[in-house]
């Protein structure tokens, strides 16, 4: 096979591994027929002219943790073959004009995580043919006009986890075939109106965790073809009447982690593929009518932390699909019996952490297949008569860390808890808060030592007689669906992120497998 | 993201010839190779050839030479892999394959399968 | 040709188990192998490259290792997902060639 260097692996199939901290320079000689080459973890810090003058097939160079902090502009000469090309992991500083000329057939073009200053239009003006660009983990500060008219074919851009402060209008203008476009964890702070009406091919557009403030009106009505749109973790206050208008395709919209105060109606939409909405972390106080109406097939709706007070009884209209509605960590007082009747295919509902100080005895009346409902850490002192009856496949239901009043009134809810012991689940029961003599004592085998009037306690109580055991529980308790970990950042369905945080605080999230963004 | 797409089913007669496609939607042709792979019935996997989408240039294992022609066309995005003189034993599903940018021969990209019947 | 195995050819077990699972090839391949997994009626799908590489997408629970003429691939905590028949490629030299596949199946 044409002759391995000593401190690389070559196969018989035309590939190059050559790996190990006592590589300094670009091993020699390299087999001619090498199709694939791989130079990583080694001691390099610069690459000089032609070193691949003789391996003219090779498709694929990869050149990836090193400590390649220079390169000649002729280093890549010869390579009219390669097609995808990574510096990636390296401490590059400056690109040399004219790096990449001759490497007529490369699509894939990978300068991520170096330490990149500044990119110029001379830069990338002889890849016509590029496909993907990764520019991510930079220190970009901006992006000149120009820099991309070039890559007219280029489907796949990253820019993220630079030091981008604004972007040119222009900037993007002639990449008509983009798909992905990602700007997230730069320092943007609003994006001009225009930025991204030459994307009409694009599919995602990621730009969590940067600054914005204000989003223009029109800014995404050029994108009708949009389908998962990031905004997630930036400075937003408001949204814009139209703003979502034209996206008909969009199937996932991040806006966790910005400061909206209000959602007007007609918001959202129409969006027929929306199926998750996450709105947590906000400063949402109140829910007017019909805001969700347009989101037919929306099946996760997440308004955990933010400051909702109000829920008009309309609020969820339209939501027939829904599966998963968190509205934990607000302050909710009360809830309209109404509100939730809408729900027909609801599933789980999160409501801890909030203000609830009771329930109405329909909240629950059309909601049949509720699996899983969180109403820990409320100021509830009973529940109505018969609340819970007509949910035969609930299997999880947390009550604990109220103020239960266990005097006469809560022996039908005691009766009712005592034989379906196995939904409470076994992490924390309710106690008694009053009155003072049983205060802490579990509300479950709390024997109430009072006169019980029978208008009280009728002969057969409302809450059903049989005990609900189920074989095999669908959400056991140590892995509860409405329990589990949600992720800090999110998890937007591609690789580049390098790294995810991850909170465990169970008594806070109460979220559900579905929920990793 | 890339999708390798095939064509459907086929049943032929022995001694008859079959054409499979290979279309790459969604995106530009492969980077690297087209391989092709076959399945026979409750049987493992065996590699058949390649072809280089952009040149033609192609390899194929010594057990099909003569008997396989890998074609591509770059104006739709499709490569085409024919096999002759087909007999019963040629009853398989076959797939194309695309090797990853790490190397050309380590397929991370697979087409749905196309099952080709070699009946009398 | 390069000649594949892989031992065993079938195992049954339960979720949650260590699962380990042998290939060897005829002469050195240095580093030179994947891994794939195939359920019924579908495709392969790579896990593992040059060995020990995971494939981006793969849970972690999947490891490789080995070099030369024996190679592991091991499922720490077999999932009901999981459940497949599982194949070895040597990437070394033309022809590129297989092993004949472990089933795994539940207990």
């Known amino acids: 096979y044409h002759g391995c260097p000593s401190e690389c692996t070559c196969s018989r199939a035309s590939q190059v591994e050559c790996t190990g901290a006592r590589i300094v320079a670009v091993p020699t000689p390299l087999p001619w027929n090498a199709m694939s080459l791989q130079i990583l973890n080694t001691h390099i810090t610069e690459l000089n002219e032609s070193p691949f003058l003789n391996i003219s097939a090779l498709i694929a160079l990869r050149i990836e943790k090193n400590e390649l902090s220079r390169i000649t502009p002729g280093a890549f000469r010869n390579l009219g073959s390669l097609r995808y090309l990574s510096l990636a992991n390296n401490k590059l500083q400056v690109l040399p004009i004219g790096l990449f000329q001759g490497l007529d057939s490369l699509e894939s073009l990978l300068l991520s995580s170096n330490q990149l200053l500044q990119i110029q239009p001379a830069h990338f003006s002889q890849c016509s043919n590029l496909k993907e660009l990764q520019l991510h983990g930079n220190h970009l500060e901006y992006i000149p006009d120009g820099a991309f008219d070039h890559l007219v074919g280029l489907t796949k851009l990253n820019l993220g986890k630079n030091s981008l402060t604004h972007i040119s209008p222009r900037v993007f203008q002639h990449l008509g075939n983009l798909q992905v476009l990602r700007l997230y964890e730069n320092r943007l702070t609003d994006i001009p109106m225009g930025t991204f009406d030459g994307l009409v091919n694009l599919q995602e557009l990621a730009l969590q965790q940067n600054q914005i403030g204000l989003l223009s009106p029109g800014l995404f009505h050029n994108n009708h073809n949009l389908q998962r749109l990031y905004l997630s973790n930036n400075h937003i206050s408001q949204l814009p009447p139209s703003v979502f208008m034209q996206l008909p395709q969009l199937n996932r919209l991040t806006l966790f982690g910005n400061s909206l105060k209000e959602l007007s109606p007609g918001i959202f939409g129409p969006m027929p593929n929306l199926r998750e909405l996450w709105l947590y972390d906000n400063h949402i106080s109140s829910l007017p009518d019909n805001v969700f109406s347009n989101l037919r097939q929306l099946q996760v709706l997440i308004l955990s932390r933010n400051q909702i007070s109000f829920i008009s009884p309309g609020a969820f209209n339209g939501l027939t699909e829904l599966r998963e509605l968190s509205l934990h960590t607000n302050a909710l007082q009360d809830l309209d019996g109404n509100v939730f009747r809408m729900l027909a295919n609801l599933q789980n509902i999160s409501l801890q952490n909030n203000r609830l100080r009771q329930l109405p005895g329909n909240i629950f009346a059309n909601v049949n297949g509720l699996m899983a409902i969180q109403l820990q850490n409320n100021q509830l002192e009973n529940l109505p008569l018969g609340i819970f009856d007509h949910l035969g496949k609930l299997c999880e239901l947390r009550l604990y860390d109220n103020p239960w009043r266990c005097d006469s009134d809560i022996l039908p809810l005691r009766n009712w808890l005592l034989l379906n012991q196995p939904r409470l689940g076994t992490d924390t029961v309710p106690v008694c808060f009053s009155p003072a003599n049983v205060r802490g004592q579990s509300l479950i085998i709390i024997n109430v030592n009072v006169a019980v009037p029978s208008v009280h306690v009728p002969e057969v109580p409302s809450y059903p007689e049989t005990p609900w055991y189920p074989d095999t529980p669908s959400y056991p308790d140590t892995t509860s669906v409405s329990s589990t970990t949600e992720l800090t950042s999110p998890v937007e369905d591609y690789t580049d992120l390098t790294t995810i945080q991850v909170t465990d605080d169970r008594s806070v999230w109460g979220m559900t497998q579905a929920q990793s963004g | 993201q890339v999708q390798l797409v095939q064509s459907g089913a086929e049943v032929k007669k022995p001694g008859a010839s079959v054409e499979v496609s290979c279309k790459a939607s969604?995106?530009?042709?492969?980077?690297?190779?087209i391989n092709w792979v076959r399945q026979a019935p409750g049987q493992g996997l065996e590699w058949m050839g390649w072809?280089?989408?952009?040149?033609?240039?192609?390899t194929y294992a010594q057990k099909f030479q003569g008997r396989v022609t890998m074609t591509r066309d770059t104006s739709t995005s499709t490569v085409y892999m024919e096999l002759s003189s087909l007999r019963s034993e040629d009853t398989a599903v076959y797939y194309c394959?695309?090797?990853?940018?790490?190397?050309?021969?380590?397929?991370?990209?697979w087409g749905q399968g196309t099952l080709v019947t070699v009946s009398s | 040709d390069i000649q594949m195995t892989q031992s065993p050819s079938s195992l049954s077990a339960s979720v949650g188990d260590r699962v380990t699972i042998t290939c060897r090839a005829s002469?050195?391949?240095?580093?030179?192998l994947a891994w794939y997994q195939q359920k019924s009626g579908k495709a392969p799908k790579l896990l593992i490259y040059?060995?020990?590489s995971l494939q981006s997408g793969v849970p972690s629970r999947f490891s490789g290792s080995g070099s030369g003429t024996d190679f592991t691939l091991t499922i720490s905590s077999l999932q009901p997902e999981d459940f497949a028949t599982y194949y070895c490629?040597?990437?070394?030299?033309?022809?590129?060639?297989f092993g004949p596949g472990t089933k795994v199946d539940i207990k």
């Open positions: 394959a695309s090797g990853g940018s790490y190397s050309p021969w380590y397929f991370d990209l």
């Open positions: 969604g995106g530009t042709f492969s980077s690297y190779a």
């Open positions: 072809i280089d989408p952009k040149s033609g240039d192609t």
């Open positions: 002469q050195s391949i240095s580093s030179w």
């Open positions: 040059a060995a020990s």
């Open positions: 490629q040597q990437a070394y030299s033309f022809p590129f060639t």
